[in-house]
Interface confidence: low
């Protein structure tokens, strides 16, 4: 009922709670002397469904038959309207529309851990939209019965608060849930189980790992479990991996040896437990243990390359370069690299440990046969050395690869191609493609990059440390035993016209011709590989087209003679530079007048 209903009543038949689709009769009746003040025939009773008028009647009572009410609660209010006054609320009623409960499905019970309590869950089925009470009943051996009720509108879980113990692990228990509301009741199918079926062990705890003799091959995982656990499953993975390795073990008694871990790798370990081979369920996974495996001596061999530079008649500079071992080869933190330089005929050897670098430069005599061995060392030992005999890599002209070309291949890639050397191509054991930024000074501090290619390959895609708008000096070496031949080319991955022209710094007169000298364009303004320089000149104050001389670009060249100028004529000269993409703007202009005799 709504409010105090002092003036009248609203009755609902057959009930305030009805089945979806049922018809309901609503009667609104005034109490004696509660109608309009003067004329009771003027009483106008109005029935509202929520705030919408659905029926009215003049008199002391109103009957209305209502159908098609939706699931849930509908509010009906009866009001009285008199002449010249506001409507007065008489009374109201709520009607609850719902359905009988469906049979609860998938009843399942679980006890978390040997000390936990039995809790059951089920699926309620569709919502009844009515107050529904659930009763969970558990019957066990010796006619024992436990019962628990749940009055929550959305009840699908109940904890009995009782603990099943393993005294009789095979004893049967039966659970059943019954749902009851005003429109009916329904019970689930019974669920029968034993202690072993429903006890779900707690996840293992106190997980530790031990490496005997600090060796990854002698690794034992330890953990603690509840007393009745029979089975464990272990899963582990490197921390940077998404894939787990899985191991199932029986009667592990809280320890298991792992044989396939990689050295110097952080792993994540988790363990789960179960009481019985085929009954019951696995525990949740334990909390993760994260641990790093110990180092092992490095495996694999360093990729080593070198450069020779002539210093003077008796000395040469050797620069050694090597690439880091992969993580799986280093098998630990590389503490230093050991470089051994040996003169093969005299047997003299020099060993040096290099820390923090992957290169080493030394000066040795030009005479003698020299070899180097480079190995990487971590806390457990050294990799086997890479041995290289130092030779003149470009000495064998017949081994030089032919028709070397370098073409841009997409963003920051250069495709290098070549033809095998004229000498028996089958003699080639491998090709090495080497590249470094071109610096006019031939700076030996510029980083060197290289890759090795099998003897049957005639192309290589270079992408490591390749920047746009930078020119690279690329060499292809063909190696055969203790001989090598090489060819070189300039290449870039992306180019455009240079940003500036060369700066003429001097013009000197020599026997009737002039020698122009210029400063190289800064590397960052070259915008790729330069192909040509152009020298332009024209008579001062003349409107004629300038003459020009085009010179092929050579790294070290920074002067050029011109012998077609007339004496005692003042000329204006300037220079430009060209890449494959176009010509730079002018460099500076210089005036010059040749003093020599006229022809």
């Amino acid at each position: 009922k709504i409010d105090a209903c002092k003036r009248g009543d609203v009755t609902v038949k057959p009930s305030h709670v009805i089945l979806l689709g049922s018809t309901v009769n609503i009667t609104c009746s005034l109490k004696p002397r509660q109608g309009c003040f003067h004329y009771s025939r003027r009483n106008k009773l109005i029935l509202y469904k929520f705030d919408r008028r659905i029926n009215f009647h003049h008199g002391h009572s109103l009957n209305s038959q209502v159908t098609g009410l939706p699931l849930g609660t509908t509010l009906f209010v009866c009001k009285l309207a008199c002449i010249n006054s506001d409507e007065i609320q008489i009374c109201g009623a709520e009607i609850f529309v719902g359905v009988a409960p469906e049979q609860p499905q998938n009843l399942s019970c679980i006890q978390k851990g040997e000390q936990g309590t039995v809790a059951c869950t089920w699926e309620r089925g569709r919502d009844t939209h009515l107050y529904t009470e659930y009763t969970l009943q558990l019957s066990g051996p010796k006619n024992l019965t436990w019962q628990k009720q749940c009055k929550d509108i959305y009840c699908d879980y109940l904890d009995f608060g009782i603990n099943l113990t393993p005294e009789s692990p095979e004893s049967n228990f039966t659970a059943k849930v019954t749902a009851v509301n005003s429109l009916g009741s329904s019970s689930s199918l019974p669920s029968t189980f034993t202690f072993l079926d429903i006890v779900r062990p707690l996840p293992p705890w106190d997980i530790r790992i031990k490496f005997q003799k600090a060796s990854v091959s002698r690794c034992t995982l330890y953990w603690r479990d509840e007393g009745l656990v029979l089975l464990n499953r272990l899963r582990y993975r490197p921390s940077n991996s998404r894939l787990w390795n899985m191991v199932n073990v029986t009667k592990a008694k809280g320890r298991h040896d792992l044989l396939d871990l990689k050295p110097f790798t952080e792993y994540e370990f988790q363990i789960s437990s179960k009481l019985h081979l085929y009954k019951g369920s696995w525990s949740d996974w334990s909390e993760s243990l994260r641990a790093q495996t110990p180092e092992e001596e490095p495996t694999g061999m360093l990729d080593v390359w070198y450069m020779k530079r002539h210093i003077d008649y008796s000395r040469q500079q050797i620069s050694l370069f090597w690439k880091n071992l992969s993580v799986s080869e280093a098998r630990g933190k590389i503490l230093h690299y050991q470089v051994t330089l040996q003169e093969l005929t005299g047997g003299k050897a020099m060993t040096q440990n290099i820390t923090g670098h992957t290169s080493w430069t030394t000066v040795i005599p030009r005479t003698g046969n020299w070899a180097v061995a480079v190995s990487a060392a971590n806390s457990k030992g050294s990799s086997l050395p890479t041995r290289i005999n130092i030779m003149n890599l470009c000495e064998a002209g017949l081994l030089a690869p032919r028709q070397v070309s370098a073409n841009s291949e997409g963003m920051d890639n250069i495709l290098v191609t070549w033809q095998p050397p004229r000498k028996d191509p089958s003699a080639v054991q491998e090709y090495v493609v080497e590249w470094r930024e071109l610096h006019p000074g031939g700076d030996t501090q510029v980083p060197l990059n290289w890759l090795r290619s099998r003897p049957y390959n005639v192309s290589a895609l270079i992408s490591e440390n390749i920047k746009s708008y930078i020119c690279y000096e690329i060499r292809v070496y063909a190696l055969s035993g203790d001989q090598g031949g090489c060819s070189s080319i300039l290449g870039n991955s992306k180019h455009k016209a240079p940003l500036s022209g060369p700066h003429i710094n001097a013009i000197t007169e020599e026997k009737g011709s002039i020698l122009i000298s210029w400063n190289s364009i800064p590397v960052q303004e070259q915008m790729g590989c330069l192909l040509h320089y152009r020298i332009y000149w024209k008579e001062r104050d003349s409107n004629s087209q300038p003459q020009l001389c085009e010179i092929p670009y050579r790294v070290s060249q920074n002067s050029h003679p011109i012998n077609s100028l007339q004496p005692r004529v003042t000329y204006v000269l300037w220079m430009t530079a060209l890449t494959a993409a176009g010509e730079s703007s002018h460099g500076n202009e210089r005036e010059f007048c040749l003093q020599g005799k006229a022809n």
């Epitope: 040996q342 457990k380 990799s383 086997l384």
Partner: nanobody, 116 residues
Framework: QVQLQESGGGLVQPGGSLTLSCAAS????????MSWVRQAPGKGLEWVSS????????YYTDSVKGRFTTARDNAKNTLYLRMNSLKPEDTAVYYC?????????RGQGTQVTVSS
């Protein structure tokens, strides 16, 4: 101090076999990579083979690959070189060395002569 004693050399016909041993003392043998090197008459030292400290990884110079096998017994502090299909060009003094490069301490060597 480091002591290395090679043994097992001798005269053998081409195609024959020999096993050289190297007894080590004075250092932690099981923590060191080891190698075999040789010196043919009138020539410089030539690296032959290396073996990692645990014995799991071995490397050989091309000319002996498939014919020679290096092994070690860390419990006995002994290094071995099993030589099969011997050729006249294998004639040399063979040394074991306390390093993976062959440039470390060496023993006195053992003479291997391959001749018919």
């Amino acid at each position: 101090q480091v002591q290395l004693q090679e043994s097992g050399g001798g005269l053998v016909q081409p195609g024959g076999s020999l096993t050289l041993s190297c007894a080590a003392s004075g250092f932690t043998f099981s923590s060191n990579a080891m190698s075999w090197v040789r010196q043919a008459p009138g020539k410089g030292l030539e690296w032959v083979s290396s073996i990692s400290s645990g014995g799991g990884t071995t490397y050989y110079t091309d000319s002996v690959k498939g014919r020679f096998t290096t092994a070690r017994d860390n419990a006995k502090n002994t290094l071995y070189l099993r030589m099969n299909s011997l050729k006249p060009e294998d004639t040399a003094v063979y040394y074991c060395s306390k390093s993976s490069t062959g440039s470390g301490s060496r023993g006195q060597g053992t003479q291997v002569t391959v001749s018919s």
